[in-house]
């Protein structure tokens, strides 16, 4: 889904345009 | 595992400044915002402030403008939270907490918290 | 500043009830370009650190029962426990992330 790097900080849901998805390999199950 | 771990209880005194850490460990840092949330005794939870290590960009709530610092060392994969001048008030767990940045906006892992006493 | 308000501020049941509590907010919390609902749940038990149960409003975080359901969109959100468990002592706050974070006052359930 692109980097993070272009992603700008914003103040909330609110501001989003799209819903970025970045792989969290944290919940990734084997 | 996604972790954050916060430092022990600190007993500061009036008028004085207290920074504490918000080590993360488990997951890519600069990804993620760090929330802060103060909760006193018995007492709600409340937002603080927020930092994206990756660029070092803030928001804080306007209650805690002045009161709060935030900062990211992204080196160590540790946030921080500075409290300048503490009173009585600023006594209260601390918490830190990964926020889900981009997509749910949730605060997906807790550290355990700081419990700050302001006391002379 | 978004103002998320609670109700009850507390209640008792018996296990296997079911309980709802209520959440809303003094704006919409819904982006129509997500078409997400920017409302989490969470769950704090006595002396531990709030748990994500909870997002957009009525997903589910991983690993959470499903005798938890979050329901509602705009301004009116309601968590709903299907079948109260004794573990299910706790204290349960809304929050909004549409605009910066708020916290809802928490809603104290206690088990009969």
């Known amino acids: 889904c692109g980097s993070k790097d272009n992603i700008k900080h914003v103040p909330g849901g609110g501001s989003v345009q799209i819903v970025y998805k970045p792989v969290d390999l944290s919940k990734v199950t084997s | 595992q996604v972790q954050l771990q916060q430092s022990g209880p600190e007993l500061v005194k009036p008028g004085t400044s207290v920074k504490m850490p918000c080590k993360a460990s488990?997951?890519?840092?600069?990804?993620?915002?760090i929330s802060w949330v103060k909760q006193r005794t018995g007492q709600g939870l409340e937002w603080i402030g927020e930092?994206?290590?990756?660029?070092?960009?803030?928001y804080y709530n306007e209650k805690f403008k002045g009161k709060a610092t935030l900062t990211a060392d992204k080196s160590s994969n540790t946030a921080y939270m500075q409290l300048s001048s503490v009173t009585s008030e600023d006594s209260a767990v601390y918490f830190c907490?990964?926020?889900?940045?981009?997509?749910?906006?949730?605060?997906?892992?807790w550290g355990q918290g700081t419990s700050v006493t302001v006391s002379s | 500043d978004i103002v998320m308000s609670q109700s009850p501020s507390s209640l008792a049941v018996s296990a296997g009830e079911k309980v709802t509590m209520s959440c809303k907010s003094s704006?919409?919390?819904?982006?129509?370009?997500?078409?997400?609902?920017?409302l989490a749940w969470y769950q704090q038990k006595p002396g531990q650190s709030p748990k994500l149960l909870i997002y957009w409003a009525s997903t589910r975080e991983s690993g959470v029962p499903d005798r938890f359901t979050g329901s509602g969109s705009g301004t009116d959100f309601t968590l709903t426990i299907s079948s109260v468990q004794a573990e299910d002592l706790a204290v349960y706050y809304c929050?909004?992330?549409?605009?910066?974070?708020?916290f809802g006052g928490g809603t104290k359930l206690d088990i009969k």
């Open positions: 907490a990964r926020d889900y940045y981009g997509t749910s906006f949730a605060m997906d892992y």
């Open positions: 929050k909004q992330s549409f605009y910066l974070r708020t």
């Open positions: 704006q919409s919390l819904l982006n129509s370009r997500t078409r997400k609902n920017y």
């Open positions: 488990g997951y890519i840092f600069t990804d993620y915002v």
């Open positions: 930092i994206f290590p990756r660029s070092g960009s803030t």
